[in-house]
Amino acid sequence: EPTMYGEILSPNYPQAYPSEVEKSWDIEVPEGYGIHLYFTHLDIELSENCAYDSVQIISGDTEEGRLCGQRSSNNPHSPIVEEFQVPYNKLQVIFKSDFSNEERFTGFAAYYVATDINECTDFVDVPCSHFCNNFIGGYFCSCPPEYFLHDDMKNCGVNCSGDVFTALIGEIASPNYPKPYPENSRCEYQIRLEKGFQVVVTLRREDFDVEAADSAGNCLDSLVFVAGDRQFGPYCGHGFPGPLNIETKSNALDIIFQTDLTGQKKGWKLRYHGDPMPCPKEDTPNSVWEPDKAKYVFRDVVQITCLDGFEVVEGRVGATSFYSTCQSNGKWSNSKLKCQPVDCGIPESIENGKVEDPESTLFGSVIRYTCEEPYYYMENGGGGEYHCAGNGSWVNEVLGPELPKCVPVCGVPREPFEEKQRIIGGSDADIKNFPWQVFFDNPWAGGALINEYWVLTAAHVVEGNREPTMYVGSTSVQTSRLAKSKMLTPEHVFIHPGWKLLEVPEGRTNFDNDIALVRLKDPVKMGPTVSPICLPGTSSDYNLMDGDLGLISGWGRTEKRDRAVRLKAARLPVAPLRKCKEVKVEKPTADAEAYVFTPNMICAGGEKGMDSCKGDSGGAFAVQDPNDKTKFYAAGLVSWGPQCGTYGLYTRVKNYVDWIMKTMQENSTPRED
């Protein structure tokens, strides 16, 4: 417990103190007092620096004194032989004696009393920033007019904080400006504008005079601007050292002016105003901004339109433009939206063709369609090259978005027919020589494939069986071989409207318009043994002349057997129609004059006994295309004849091309179109 006074005596005082003693006393007087310690008796063994025996006086970490030897008072009116005055309220006294004393020493007697200290003058550090007032046991600080005492009860400052400025324009100055600003103060000013406006501060160099920085460059007095997580300053010195126009990019600004105890100057004055928050003109790739301005501010709206071939995608849908607003935080809305290349997706596959796997399906990518050569070619042109267009479609320069169409190559046998000599008078053939050859099993007859869905034959072949079974792709028509060949299923039979239907077909003498089409249920896949024959062109180039050679093929009657098992073929010339008329009809069913000969018929044969016969009906009379020697076209169809092995009559296909085309067109599926 602190005491106001006390006595301290060495051990055994006034008797001699013992050897090897160490004793300490902790003196404490109340706060606000100092200590006056004085000795009235001192008799301690003398040694150099009081090394043997001593009394030590310690204040905090400081040794105030170390005593030994004998002392007497210099003043006859005072018993004090040694004294100490400290301005602190704590003191320690330590007495030490060593192991031997050659004489008898009586030690010391000391007293302490609490004394008032003058905190205002007794310390190096002045406790008050302005006025210091001492009283017994303490002191208090006070301030000049217009200042107030801070919570630490020592420092005075001016009341310059708490102002909030919300107007869009204003002026703020340091206290007393342009008179010297108060020392030892912290002034805080707040500017709070509506969201969407940024505080812009403007100063003039001459409106700023604040105590300069120290030698280390630290401002002793400073002005700081804080906007969110951005700080401008600290600033100090004569003339404003910072930018004269500060765009804070924030609607909230704190201005902090901090001063120390010394060096007052005139201070500062600034103006501020609210600017609509600017948004940066962002570089958004692959797009254009409308309107295009040098500067965009709060509430500005731009339309961002993607360049051709680019789009904004969300989920499975896209858009080519969007709107973006400059927001109150200085950022654009919809900044997540980016114009990315249009994706045309995986290209559609096509029948009888393929498209290479694209490296990319994005805008500008190129793909190529090819047909399954040599059996198909690209009918609608365009070269098969498509690029990914801006609208998200694969587009061809010629066809646009229409897909290429792979159609069968006509009239090109995989292997040319070579007569091995001596149908009648013909040779063995391979189906690869006549890949268009179609076999009808009931009645036993032939036909010609003219495209994926259509077979051309003679009307008399199908008049009695409107659901014929047909086969393609086999040289042999043995039952076991046919099982492995391709069977064609008819969907509908179209007989030429000019073909006269009879009650008794066997008695027919008029074979005019002996032509029919069979529509197939499913498309035929082309290959080396199956491919169509061409139709004649409509130009005069396709008018047959006597002597023009044509090929016939079929499984009909031969010299040796009623029906052939393996395909036979023969090359025979076109002859004048009169040659056919002159031949006596074998087994006539009517008067010879009753047989009708028309311009719709071609007469051919008469050489080396080569002719078509029963069972070859409907097969093609194939003639080399005058405009493309690699191809054959169906100039005729095996129709009838007066006598096998002489001349035969063939339906003149050229006269029916319009009917064929019209029939096919009117009865096609959308896929064929």
Epitope: R299, V312, E314, G315, Y323, Q327, K336
Partner: antibody
């Protein structure tokens, strides 16, 4: 597939706060804006604000400024909406929604009832 | 803030009818307008975006038109599942605002 699952119904006293969560799956919320829309009983839809979870930027409707806080935790792919100083007229179904071009996906809604 | 006004507030119609709902913006919103359908107890569903684009999976009987301040949602032939409340919303500038809704009821 894309889903937004919101926290369950809440009953609060006037003056209290409520925090509604919206857990996203099937997409990364950093790639979208997350909006909050409310609908008082038998009333229309009212947009409250949005957050860009990528950088925590927020925009609030003036009506809710100072009372609403929208946050997002990208580590859990979840958006939150906190509304303070609740009053009886804040009783509503609160929806979260995802957008870039439009509000294509919505949460199932969270009913918040404010009653003394 | 941009105000969105829908009309009518409610309307009664029969299955098969052609129905038109209009939405007017207090200022130009170009084509930044979306239409939503909401059924009782359900969240809203997007029908039309950017004024005229049908969202994926939305039946072709729904169509949108307009730009600037006047917009229309048309249902060409009402189906039983179309009876609901329809909202327009502008996404031209924040705050994004909704119309007050049009309740489509069965006659």
């Amino acid at each position: 597939q894309v889903q937004l699952v919101q926290s369950g119904a809440e009953v609060k006293k006037p003056g209290a706060s409520v925090k509604v969560s919206c857990k996203a799956s099937g997409f990364n919320i950093k790639e979208y804006y997350m909006h909050w829309v409310r609908q008082a009983p038998e009333q229309g839809l009212e947009w409250m604000g949005w957050i860009d979870p990528e950088n925590a930027d927020t925009i609030y409707a003036q009506k809710f400024q100072g009372r609403v806080t929208i946050t997002a935790d990208t580590s859990t792919n979840t958006a939150y909406m906190e509304l303070s100083s609740l009053r009886s007229e804040d009783t509503a179904v609160y929806y979260c929604a995802r957008s870039r071009l439009f509000f294509a996906y919505w949460g199932q809604g969270t009913l918040v009832t404010v009653s003394s | 803030d941009i105000q969105m006004t829908q009309s009518p507030k409610s309307l009664s119609a029969s299955v098969g009818d052609r129905v038109t709902i209009t939405c007017r913006a207090s200022q130009d919103v170009r084509t930044a307008l979306d239409w939503y359908q909401q059924k009782p107890g359900q969240s809203p569903k997007l029908l039309i975006y950017s004024a005229s684009y049908r969202y994926s999976g939305v039946p072709s009987r729904f169509s949108g038109s307009g730009s600037g301040t006047d917009f229309t949602l048309t249902i060409s032939s009402l189906q039983p599942e179309d009876f609901a409340t329809y909202y327009c919303q502008q996404q031209y500038t924040t705050p994004y605002t909704f119309g007050q809704g049009t309740k489509l009821e069965i006659k």
